[in-house]
Amino acid sequence: ESSNQASLSCDRNGICKGSSGSLNSIPSGLTEAVKSLDLSNNRITYISNSDLQRCVNLQALVLTSNGINTIEEDSFSSLGSLEHLDLSYNYLSNLSSSWFKPLSSLTFLNLLGNPYKTLGETSLFSHLTKLQILRVGNMDTFTKIQRKDFAGLTFLEELEIDASDLQSYEPKSLKSIQNVSHLILHMKQHILLLEIFVDVTSSVECLELRDTDLDTFHFSELSTGETNSLIKKFTFRNVKITDESLFQVMKLLNQISGLLELEFDDCTLNGVGNFRASDNDRVIDPGKVETLTIRRLHIPRFYLFYDLSTLYSLTERVKRITVENSKVFLVPCLLSQHLKSLEYLDLSENLMVEEYLKNSACEDAWPSLQTLILRQNHLASLEKTGETLLTLKNLTNIDISKNSFHSMPETCQWPEKMKYLNLSSTRIHSVTGCIPKTLEILDVSNNNLNLFSLNLPQLKELYISRNKLMTLPDASLLPMLLVLKISRNAITTFSKEQLDSFHTLKTLEAGGNNFICSCEFLSFTQEQQALAKVLIDWPANYLCDSPSHVRGQQVQDVRLSVSECHRT
């Protein structure tokens, strides 16, 4: 017992931590003072009626990844205040409704990764009227969803079901829940997907399908009996798909009249871009989809891709597209021209070079585009990049951070409406007239700049942290500046006069510099009460670098002796 006690530490607020130890039972002597108890990653196998009897004020109990195989019937009987219960990844093969009956305050319940075959003989959750987040199922033994499983649940913020090996689904099992904001469904096979889809289409707002092999998925007409779908967002995560099955998936999505957002994360497309519809298939209508997000798409036969033209017509209404980290090196001109409503395009972490970008940003491409993100691609010339984007008449925001530009020419051409430019982490060592005068926000942080002397009459925000500047920029060159973030440079001091010269400045972040704590600097910073309102990272990040005897101390705390301040 005593070694068990030693593994647990509690603070004055009743937060007790005893995770990743060698506990083989719940420590004895727990009282009403305990508010939160984390005993995850131990070797607890058994929970008895008396273990938690006195914990009447317990709000969170985390028992994930132990070896729990038995919980006595009344183990949780005094936990009426419990809001968060995590029993995931244990050895509970039979779930009992008596455990949960007393938990009238429960908002979060995680039962994932326990080896039960079903969710028990009776409705487990019918008394949990405040439940918001529920996670159930496992990868291998959970094979059956029954009609009574979710009875009594009317509204859930999030429902996660690991039905990886599901073999039986009783119709209407999920229909009993009137509203689920986010349903996460793990299914290896697609065999029961349509049956489940029918039941959730009118109650789920965001549907997420995980780990499913859709290579052989075929859509057959649904007998929904109703078409009022609530689904606004559909996410496919770690899903396998082919050219043909993608077309079938699109037919499924066609059933969701109010679908606004489509997301594919970590998916594999085993295809070559042959999306031609067979003659008997009617044309797919993309409906109201406004946002398409693709992240880390893996296409094993990428270089065999040959024709995307059948998809072009589906894209005309889309407003926001993200295709991130998917080895994109070219967006066909024709596709760009079809994206007539596109306002936001994020191609971060891809392989774009200026010369191929020119093909993508051809005449009449992306006519409505306002924001273009090309962060961490293969761009190398600011001059070429700006020139390439001149065709985009409505472009106002450009993020080309994390490309290696190194140098900046004296002049560049940019779209005339540009307001925001992100050049952070681009290895530039100077800024020139290449930066457009129309900018309102400029980010040049994390570069090799030792000087900033550009006149930007409309600039409101300047982000220039992590450079090598030794002084604040000249305020007269930035007459409209509201925000200046200049932390982690080589600034040694700044004065009241310098700060006052920024007439419009509301926010200054200048911490993490090597301040020389002179008497003047100290008296200015310590006496100005209003300074704390402007310096958003004051006082924590303002440390003295010299004199040596105060190095590392916060500027606001340093006091120099009279003799140090009155030397002649």
Epitope: H298, L304, N325, C333, L334, L335, V353
Partner: antibody
Amino acid sequence: QVQLVQSGSELKKPGASVKLSCKASGFTFTTYGINWVRQAPGQGLEWIGWIYPRDGSTNFNENFKDRATITVDTSASTAYMELSSLRSEDTAVYFCARLTGGTFLDYWGQGTTVTVSS
Amino acid sequence: DIVLTQSPASLALSLGERATLSCRASESVEYYGTSLMQWYQQKPGQPPKLLIFGASNVESGVPDRFSGSGSGTDFTLKISRVEEEDVGMYFCQQSRKLPWTFGGGTKVEIK
């Protein structure tokens, strides 16, 4: 500046394996692909395969698929190519090259000479 | 595999003369309006050096006497006025389909 520095010459017996290294500097290693290309004495260039350090994905010329392995150590910004079951026809200079824009090789290592002889 | 055939096999030119090197692919290397064809120069004992990518884009730092053209299956590398330092082998390379392939090369010499 961008540099790819390859390991030194190797003399191997038929049937043996060789592991070549290619250390990158002057650019963000995980943002670009690394290709391996070989050139037999007095011959043309032959593409072996590539790796993308960011996700470790590889692609090989079918002629090398069973014998070549390409790996990376991102913490050391180094790519490796191992070729097994060496035969005399594998005698060549092996180059690593940076893959830019998904399609072209803009920086090359100095090459490593591998000689396979009994 | 896409086979790239380069001609001529060798080319002997006088200084200042114009050089035209040809590369023919066994099938099209077009990819949505961009030809995925590169040209490299290789001098003895050195690695290849990129000259042209995407059929016609001159790599940064390459003298402007080099130019590339062509589409589909037929591509040309031109050197407007050959200089002493242009001596070496010239290879074309396609990246339209895997495996990526190189041409057999054209040797450029000065007469």
